[in-house]
């Protein structure tokens, strides 16, 4: 067991052109805080994957207000170290993500708001117990300078915190087979501690926390005899001797439980009993709890009242992500119906409705003709969110109140002359044309191409259009 420690030295503009604008202003004072996420091995996992080695949040830094016109300086930092305790051996190689968050303190609706300013990641080799390692990482125009180390918690020592030390029982030397503990020369290496419950008769260990079985015994704690008894021999690691029945690999072989979780076989699979502060199928998720305030932007932390249980964040509308850290464009969900215009005001969504629609989401189709009278014998027709009057002959306009000039649209073709008439319009056709709108040519032989002129009307006579 031990602690990974991270010391942030500075966060500010990196070298070169394009210095970033200060994240704070007189109108929006802000302060910084940091989050570190550790994963074992040299994994290139997504930022959202579990921080299997652990995670930590810093305190909030001092409030900072930009001086107008001044370039962004190094920003004031929170006091103290970020500490990530680890329960198991230190893996030696690890991946890290360090996030710089900005807490805006302006008088915006909703009180403080959080936004991610920068995220750096890297993969490193590090021995526990060594000196501080210094690092510089850049994210866009920002630069983060920091140091880190892993240190073992007594009684563990060594580059992986797997060796245990105890005070000497005798002043001069350590017990048989046990070496002094450098650099603590006045202490001695302690015997290995096998996995809890490992059978003292049938199991042994070469690394702390493991349980390897003597031949003829199996199970996670070496308590299950192999059924063919002729194979039993008093010593030696388990092996598949000819004629012996050695069971196939069990679900707990290799201990799938991370972070010091203990594995127990179930009829179908395995079950991990996780230490305090970890959860998940394999104890892979570190125990950030609701008390750590993990929900940003007004999110409510549900569950996770103690380190043994997970938490979830219920995010206010407009935010999402496991910590409510991502702002959502709520208008992208197209909440306004019937062609309404969406406005995300931050504190609320508003829909500006097209004519003929109403309601918070423009969901109500107004009865366009309700209370609408079309004058002069016109009839009301609903459609497209607006009423329309179909007017009687001789009338026009939105409500059929205007007397129409039936000749305004030049309805008579081929040079015919239009006359307004009480029942509509009349076209006086030019020579050679006939029809209600003078649309048909008269053939030279006197036969018309299309319907014959009605009785009593000669070609060329004015035609009344009914």
């Amino acid at each position: 067991a031990g602690v990974f420690e991270l010391q942030i030295h500075s966060f500010g503009p990196g070298p070169g052109p394009g210095a970033p604008r200060s994240p704070c202003s007189a109108r929006l004072p802000c302060r910084l805080f940091f989050r570190v996420c550790l994963k074992p091995g040299l994994s290139e996992e997504a930022a959202e994957s579990p921080c299997a080695l652990g995670a930590a949040l810093s305190a909030r830094g001092p409030v900072y207000t930009e001086q107008p016109g001044a370039p962004a300086p190094d920003l004031p930092l929170p006091d103290g170290l970020l500490q990530v305790p680890f329960r198991d051996a230190w893996p030696g190689t690890f991946s890290f993500i360090i996030e710089t968050w900005r807490e805006e303190l302006g008088d915006q609706i909703g009180g403080p708001a959080w936004s991610l300013l920068a995220r750096v990641a890297g993969r490193r080799r590090l021995a526990a117990g060594g000196p501080w390692a210094r690092d510089i990482q850049r994210a866009g125009a920002w630069e983060l300078r920091f140091s880190y180390r892993a240190r073992c918690e007594p009684p563990a020592v060594g580059t992986a915190c797997t060796r245990l030390c105890r005070p000497r029982s005798a002043p001069s030397r350590c017990g048989p087979g046990l070496r002094p503990c450098a650099p603590l020369e006045d202490e001695c290496e302690a015997p290995l501690v096998c996995r809890a419950g490992c059978s003292p008769e049938h199991g042994f260990c070469e690394q702390p926390g493991e349980c390897r079985c003597l031949e003829g015994w199996t199970g996670p704690l070496c308590t299950v005899p192999v059924s063919t008894s002729s194979c039993l021999s008093p010593r030696g690691p388990s092996s598949a001797t000819t004629g012996c029945l050695v069971p196939g690999p069990g679900p707990c072989d290799g201990n799938p439980c991370a972070n010091g979780g203990s594995c127990s076989e179930t009829p179908r699979s395995f079950e991990c009993t996780c230490p305090r502060g970890f959860y998940g199928l394999r104890c892979e998720v570190s125990g950030v709890t609701c008390a750590d305030g993990p929900c940003f932007n007004g999110g409510l932390c549900v569950g996770g009242a103690d380190p043994d249980s997970a938490y979830i964040c219920h995010c206010p509308p407009g935010f999402q992500g496991s910590n409510c850290e991502k702002r959502v464009d709520r208008c992208s969900l197209q909440p306004c119906r019937n062609g309404g215009l969406c406005l995300d005001l931050g504190h609320a969504l508003r829909c500006r409705c097209r004519a003929g629609f109403a309601g918070p989401r423009c969901e109500h189709d107004l009865d366009d003709c309700a209370g609408r009278a079309c004058a002069n014998g016109g009839t009301c027709v609903e459609g497209g969110g607006a009423h329309r009057c179909s007017c009687a002959l001789g009338f026009g306009g939105r409500d059929c109140r205007e007397r129409a000039d039936p000749c305004a649209a030049r309805p008579c073709a081929h040079g015919g002359r239009c006359y307004a008439h009480f029942s509509g319009l009349v076209c006086a056709c030019a020579p050679g044309y006939m029809g209600a709108r003078c649309e048909f040519p008269v053939h030279p032989d006197g036969a018309s191409a299309l319907p014959a002129a009605p009785p009593g009307l000669r070609p060329g006579d004015p035609q009344r259009y009914l």
């Epitope: 909703g110 403080p112 008390a291 219920h314 504190h347 969504l349 918070p360």
Partner: antibody
Framework: QVQLQESGPGLVKPSETLSLTCTVS????????WSWIRQPPGKGLEWISY???????NYNPSLKSRVSISVDTSKNQFSLRLSSVTAADTAVYYC????????????WGQGTLVTVSS | EIMLTQSPDTLSLSPGERATLSCRAS???????LAWYQQKPGQAPRLLIY???SRAAGVPDRFSGSGSGTDFTLTISRLAPEDFVVYYC?????????FGGGTKVEIK
Amino acid sequence: QVQLQESGPGLVKPSETLSLTCTVSSDSISSYYWSWIRQPPGKGLEWISYIYYSGISNYNPSLKSRVSISVDTSKNQFSLRLSSVTAADTAVYYCARISVAGFFFDNWGQGTLVTVSS
Amino acid sequence: EIMLTQSPDTLSLSPGERATLSCRASQSVSSSYLAWYQQKPGQAPRLLIYGASSRAAGVPDRFSGSGSGTDFTLTISRLAPEDFVVYYCQQYGISPLTFGGGTKVEIK
């Protein structure tokens, strides 16, 4: 301005189920979380439950086994059911809108008194 | 759950005086997720302050909030006649949402 109106019986017999509905006007129920809070006569406020149109809900652990909350977006309403009531459930029941800035209550109904008595 | 303890239970003051109401949490309220409400007799509560110190729309500037962690304060700089009512605090950082027991401000 959003308006919330509680409705439901003012008198419920012990061991029966209390049912209340909150009708929301001038706002879309899909834009906010909605909650129920109660206040026994002469006492303080107690949060009961909240719901979002998507179905996300949360309950006060002290009442969870007896409470259910539901939402009807088509009617712009949400409802509360509290089963196996006793005299201790006598209270003014408020429906309220939860702010988009956090889980506090920025608009309240005027409240409805529910008395549990035989 | 986070328990909120308001003190005093009753505050006796005269109009024009300054009122200081306290709300103490049993554990830290993350990110100052604390609100204050005012409740007049026979009415629903009304939001005054959220985020520990931000005034809600339409709230007179004689009301102000402060504090962080476990200790929060509502201050009424000059008590108006209509301010002699009951005040509640509420935390909204960790479920379940919880209210304080209330402080009654009465005329001396």
